[in-house]
Every structure is written in C-alpha cells, then in structure tokens.
Amino acid sequence: GKMYGPGGGKYFSTTEDYDHEITGLRVSVGLLLVKSVQVKLGDSWDVKLGALGGNTQEVTLQPGEYITKVFVAFQAFLRGMVMYTSKDRYFYFGKLDGQISSAYPSQEGQVLVGIYGQYQLLGIKSIGFEWNYPLEEPTTEPPVNLTYSANSPVGR
C-alpha cells in the first residue's frame, strides 16, 4: 500500500482483524509531533503503535460510522492528521502543517480498516492506510451534517 512521509525506522501495523471494525482511535501528540496511534477494534483496544510520550486524544465512532478519508501532514515526522467519517464528522489531531497529503480508497464504499507505517524515537516517520469494505454494508442515506473536532476545527 501507499505510504506517506519520508520513511525510516521500525515498522508498525495494526492487527489484521476480519471480524471487527475500527470503533475508536487514540492519537498521542507531543512537541508538535504525532507520537503514536492506537485503534479500537470492536470493544478492544489494539496495541499502541509508534513512539512513547505525548498527550493522548481519544475519539469514539458511532455505530455504523467509518473513517473514509484522511489528511496527513509531514515535516520530517508526522505533524498532524484529520480523519473524516461517513457521518460527515472529522477528527483533528496535531497540526496540519508541512507537506499535506490526502488518503482515500480507490473503491467506492470502502473504509479504513488498518494503519501501518514506520517510527523512530521522536515520532512517526511514515504512515499508510488499509482500506476495505465494511463488514456490514450500510443502507446509505445522505449524511447528516455533523462536525466534531478532537482539537481544532478544519474546513471541509
């Protein structure tokens, strides 16, 4: 899969789970860098991935809500991320400055099911996103306009 960022360091990856969706996220940010990410798969938190330290922000997805697009910002390390959901919400982690890239699936209807990348002592050097179809296909109605920020808002 495609990786964003300069790369280098140890590899990390969320657990491949064919039975659960991503239901929550924890992202730790410190010294203007994203230090680590952690996903909740069903009712259980997966292992924390990345470097130590930082302040942790936690977000919970609603039932039937999925992450459908991600913006990432790099300046040597991962500086920030914005995650957009199928319910027209977004979660903002860190600062969106530096080299900004967007990640989204090639298939209509696919959602975020995993995160992988590389990290060093100070933080995340590269990140990639695994997309797949949700376990239960929603009967999709046009989204309700809701916004939520785990930090500062960002324009859609």
Epitope: Y18, K69, S102, Y104, S106, Q107, E108, G109, V113, N132, Y133, P134, L135, E137, P138, T139, T140, E141, P142, P143, R156
Partner: antibody
C-alpha cells in the same frame, strides 16, 4: 426520482478535446460518487473513473489516466468528463452512472442515456 | 488488473429455454474480510443503457424477475435465466468491484 441527463452527441476533429456533461436530478451529487463508463461501437463496457463531488477526489483506470479528466460542479448538480487528444479510438458512447442507495458499493443502478462522441476528420 | 472473461460470446435460444452463461475472473473476487463476492451482472438491450440485475454474485436487484439467478464464488460465476422470455434478448455483462472496476466482454443472447 433519480435521473441522469447527459449532453448531446458530439462530432469532433482528431486532436481536439471534448467535455461531456451529466446533470443529476432527484438527488444531490455531493452524496454520491459519479462514475463514467465508455462503450465503443459494438463493443463492451470500460470503466473510466469516478469523482467524489463533495471534495473533488478522483480515481481513474490507469489506461484512461491522461486521456480523461472528471470534474463536478455541485452548484449545478452536474458531473463532467473531458477527453483530450482525441483519436478514432475515442469514438464511443460515454455513460455516467451512480450506485444504488441500498449499498455503499459501486453497483451501478442508475445510468445516463449516454453521449455518442464521434472523432472524424 | 483483474481480467473478466465471459463465455460464450453469443448464445441462440428459444423462448422458455433455460440458459446459463459464465464469467471467470483472473483473481478471486471473494473478499476474505466481508466474505462477499464483489461481482455484478448487467443487462443491456439494443440502444439502451445497461441495467443492474445482480450484485454480490447472487443478490437480485429490486424489481428484477426471479427467473434471473446469479451463483458462484471466487473466480467462477454463472448467470442463469430459468425460462427465457423475448424481452430477455440482450447482452449480459459481468463486472468486478474488487479492485477498481472491470467489465467482461459480454454474452449476447439471441433468438434461435
């Protein structure tokens, strides 16, 4: 009800470019990806690409990269397909399509009537 | 690229006959996560736009007569029309939605 109304037939010179339109009614294109499909005379169907009109994100079949450009105007609820450097190989009917509401996967339940593009000197 | 191969390319039938047509993909369309096959069947009558008949290999689209049945898994799929009617004369295309989107070349159903 959902309708996709496409622009009329085009006769264009080799090397020129053409821009086709697909005007949606009965739904807001911001809520659905819009796909384009090519059908050459007496031949099968080829998927060209899609656009997410809400943010302009696009994906193309690699063989149409550089040939096709998909855009959308949410204010007029219209998707567009621009084809450049036209040759006789581009002579075809072009369809816009949208998925069903019952599933988020791209099963094309709604189709435009098609636009015939003829490339001829 | 996933290649979709349909056979036969044409089929001459009489009204009331049972007909089957095949679609093979160059790689499995069974998603190990969702356990669904990302294959659809479309019908295209002369001078008309295609019409969705079946998706997920075997789910009939709303309003499609139950004489149309989709089956198969992995790389081998079949569309069966239990009793062909005159209005079924058309070209039938399979399409994968597993990795980007690819159509087969079609099977043309003609009257004997």
């Amino acid at each position: 009800q959902v309708q996709l109304k496409q622009s009329g037939a085009e006769l264009v010179r080799p090397g020129a470019l053409v821009k086709l339109s697909c005007k949606a009614s009965g739904f807001n294109i911001k809520d659905y990806y819009m796909h384009w499909v090519k059908q050459r005379p007496e031949q099968g169907l080829e998927w060209i690409g899609w656009i997410d009109p809400e943010n302009g994100n696009t994906i193309y079949d690699p063989k149409f990269q550089g040939k096709a450009s998909i855009t959308a105007d949410t204010s007029s609820n219209t998707a567009y397909l621009q084809l450049s450097s036209l040759t006789s190989e581009d002579t075809a009917v072009y369809y816009c399509a949208r998925r069903a509401i019952t599933t988020a996967t791209a099963w094309f339940a709604y189709w435009g009537q098609g636009t015939l593009v003829t490339v001829s000197a | 690229d996933i290649v979709m191969t349909q056979s036969p390319s044409s089929l001459a039938v009489s009204a009331g006959e049972k007909v089957t047509m095949s679609c093979k993909s160059s790689q499995s369309l069974l998603n190990s996560r969702t356990r669904k096959n990302y294959l659809a069947w479309y019908q295209q009558k002369p001078g008309q736009s295609p019409k969705l008949l079946i998706y997920w290999a075997s789910t009939r689209e709303s309003g499609v007569p139950d004489r149309f049945t989709g089956s198969g898994s992995g790389t081998d799929f079949t569309l069966t029309i239990s009793s062909v009617q005159a209005e079924d004369l058309a070209v039938y295309y399979c399409k994968q939605s597993y990795n980007l989107y690819t159509f087969g070349a079609g099977t043309k159903l003609e009257l004997k």
